[in-house]
């Protein structure tokens, strides 16, 4: 069964800067990755970035730098201030659309006791939805 993992990290240098890393553990071909915050994409969450393997990357503030790390993982840097700034308990979700498995989504947030600059290891997060 495919799995999605999500890792959230707060940067030590800037407390309003977050790095989200997501990966897909499956054998299918990824066709699209959507990163959102505030809940799953399409269920109250707000899209931060859409990464297409061939067409490029479309991102919305406060997303600053999204990129493919490998063919099955992506990273996204957020830099916010004021109303658009993420906070420590913000939930970030990643949805991977793949063929032939379909869509798989997982969410994660900063570990409760994490110090700036630290993060939980990238373990698979609970899968919220598989379309």
């Amino acid at each position: 069964t495919p799995e999605v993992w999500v890792q959230v990290r707060m940067e030590a240098t800037e407390l309003s800067s977050f790095t989200i890393r997501c990966g897909f553990l499956g054998s299918g071909s990824i066709s699209l990755v959507t990163v959102s915050w505030g809940g799953p994409n399409g269920a109250g969450g707000t899209t931060l970035a859409v990464l297409h393997p061939e067409r490029g990357i479309r991102q919305w503030a406060p997303a600053r730098q999204a990129r493919w790390e490998t063919q099955s993982s992506i990273s996204l840097i957020l830099e916010g201030s004021g109303a658009s700034s993420p906070c420590a308990n913000t939930t970030f979700c990643c949805k991977f659309a793949s063929f032939p498995e379909g869509s798989w989504e997982a969410c994660g947030s900063l570990p409760p006791s994490s110090d700036p600059g630290l993060s939980a290891p990238p373990t698979p997060a609970p899968i919220l939805r598989a379309d």
Partner: antibody, heavy 120, light 113 residues
């Protein structure tokens, strides 16, 4: 073939607003995002933002998010950009551009541009 | 935002000469998924709107003469005109189409001697 029609020029007063139009023809209007680009005389190109005609979703360059508002009218296959609180810095040629389906941010088809002059 | 820097700002060449112009990006434009470089080149003739010449660093748009050759990878890119023609008089802009916001270089003005 793809055509993007823009008015040639607009003369507007400082402090006012202007709404520029871009009428699309030759393709399915809702099939690709519409981009807007600014070019000041003798200078380079700046991306203002984009709108998805199918659902009205927008994406702005942070520099222009309080200056430009993008909308579309499906019935006439026309995209609009409203520029507010105009100053001399807004005097420029404004292009609309759409893209083919191969990449998000290649500007494949361009309008002829609307020259906006802000002057009292 | 990704900063694009072009050089030279202008150059004058005779018909038939080979022309090269440079574009550098402040971060890599190489897509880690498919190893494509998301870099485009545009030509803007006097009084006209820009026209797409090359995308993905080296793919010519349809109808673009094969004397226009895009190359490079990562952060360093080049547009070469193998044998310049009088009708190539124009400004040339590079643009990263890697991510939002797409950004353009300041341009290279090509003059014909």
């Amino acid at each position: 073939q793809v055509q993007l029609q823009q008015p040639g020029a607009e003369l507007v007063k400082p402090g006012t607003s202007v709404k520029l139009s871009c009428k699309a023809a030759g393709y399915i209007f809702t099939s690709s995002w519409m981009h807007w680009v600014k070019q000041r005389p003798g200078q380079g190109l700046e991306w203002i933002g984009e709108i998805n005609p199918s659902d009205g979703r927008t994406n702005y360059n942070e520099k222009f998010k309080n200056k430009a508002t993008l909308t579309v009218d499906h019935s006439s296959s026309t995209a609009y950009m409203q520029l507010s609180s105009l100053t001399s810095e807004d005097s420029a040629v404004y292009y609309c551009a759409s893209n083919a389906d191969r990449a998000y941010y290649t500007m494949d088809y361009w309008g002829q541009g609307t020259s906006v002059t802000v002057s009292s | 935002d990704i900063v694009m820097t072009q050089s030279p700002s202008s150059l004058a060449m005779s018909v038939g000469q080979k022309v090269t112009m440079s574009c550098k990006s402040s971060q890599s434009l190489l897509n880690g998924f498919n190893q494509r470089n998301f870099l485009a080149w545009y030509q803007q003739k006097p009084g006209q709107s820009p026209k797409l010449l090359v995308y993905f660093a080296s793919t010519r748009d349809s109808g673009v003469p094969d004397r226009f050759i895009g190359s490079g990878s990562g952060t360093d890119f080049t547009l070469t005109i193998s044998s310049v023609q009088a009708e190539d008089l124009a400004d040339y802009f590079c643009q990263q189409h890697y991510s939002t916001p797409p950004t353009f270089g300041g341009g290279t003005k090509l003059e014909i001697k």
